[in-house]
């Protein structure tokens, strides 16, 4: 846990038959059928993997 990998999702958008590919810092959100910024997953027993506020961890392309 903690490492980000290239995510290639098999989910298909409502308007396209092409599988959605997301870059390293994104994941496919089926709600909006798009690649979106994705945080590191955490579980109740391990807590956050980062001490940063949720929603701000490991996003080098976003301004501080």
């Amino acid at each position: 846990m903690g490492a980000r990998r290239l995510r290639v999702r098999s989910q298909r958008s409502r308007d396209s038959s092409v599988p959605t590919q997301c870059n390293q810092t994104e994941c496919f959100d089926p709600l909006v059928r798009n690649c979106v910024s994705c945080e590191l997953f955490h579980t109740p027993d391990t807590g956050h993997t980062s001490s940063l506020e949720p929603g701000t961890a490991l996003q080098p392309q976003e301004g501080s």
Partner: antibody, heavy 125, light 107 residues
């Protein structure tokens, strides 16, 4: 610090229009989805619309389809809700919210993690 | 659209009680369910996402479980600040839909 601030609410007559704004700070809206959720007085939460500012994709609740338009200006880091042909039943507090996705074995584990303070829209003659 | 049916619509409980709120989806939503707490005049606050994951800063007395169509929010020992209205929400498919809410009142 992540913050969402709504503005633009007020009193409007039936059939009138309003434009709500949702100014975001502490994160970039272009890589998220932004949602509008409303709450009529004494009632529950009702999702209204979402937008992915990166590509302009949108979706709407049936109750507002054709009357409301969600948009975003990534240069201003702000989302908007243009509300036309307003009805008495549109009277509510309108919240904007940011959806977060956590990477899990199932893909995106998502929810609305940050909400604005809300802006009251009253439709009355 | 996916309907989310919450029960009960309201309940009365005492400090220290164990409280359980359930939410049933009209179709399979996997684990794409979140729970929110709302107090009068305030915006909702996220408690649980992904059906069972505790959001940052939320006390560990809150827990969520379930997958598919049946979901539960449990407060293991009710505290004075927990008296509020709780909502479930599915985000498996658009439109995202909320349950009608459960108001937790003081007995």
């Amino acid at each position: 610090e992540v913050q969402l601030v709504e503005s633009g609410g007020g009193l409007v007559q039936p059939g009138g229009s309003l434009r709500l704004s949702c100014a975001a700070s502490g994160f970039t809206i272009s890589r998220r989805s932004i949602h509008w959720v409303r709450q009529a007085p004494g009632k529950g939460l009702e999702w209204v619309a979402w937008i992915t500012p990166s590509d302009g994709n949108t979706d709407y609740a049936d109750s507002v389809k054709g009357r409301f338009t969600i948009s975003a200006d990534t240069s201003k880091n702000t989302a908007y809700l243009q509300m036309n042909s307003l009805r008495a039943e549109d009277t509510a507090v309108y919240y904007c919210a940011r959806r977060v996705c956590y990477s899990s074995v199932r893909g995106c584990a998502g929810a609305m993690d940050y909400w604005g303070q809300g802006t009251l829209v009253t439709v009355s003659s | 659209d996916i309907q989310m049916t919450q029960s009960p619509s309201s309940l009365s409980a005492s400090v220290g009680d164990r409280v359980t709120i359930t939410c049933r989806a009209s179709q399979d939503v996997s684990t794409a369910v979140a729970w929110y707490q709302q107090k009068p005049g305030k915006a909702p606050k996220l408690l649980i996402y992904g059906a069972s994951n505790l959001y940052s800063g939320v006390p560990s007395r809150f827990s969520g479980s379930g997958s598919g169509t049946d979901f539960t929010l449990t407060i293991s020992s009710l505290q004075p600040e927990d008296f509020a209205t709780y909502y479930c929400q599915q985000s498996h498919a658009s439109p995202p839909t909320f349950g009608q809410g459960t108001k937790v009142e003081i007995k």
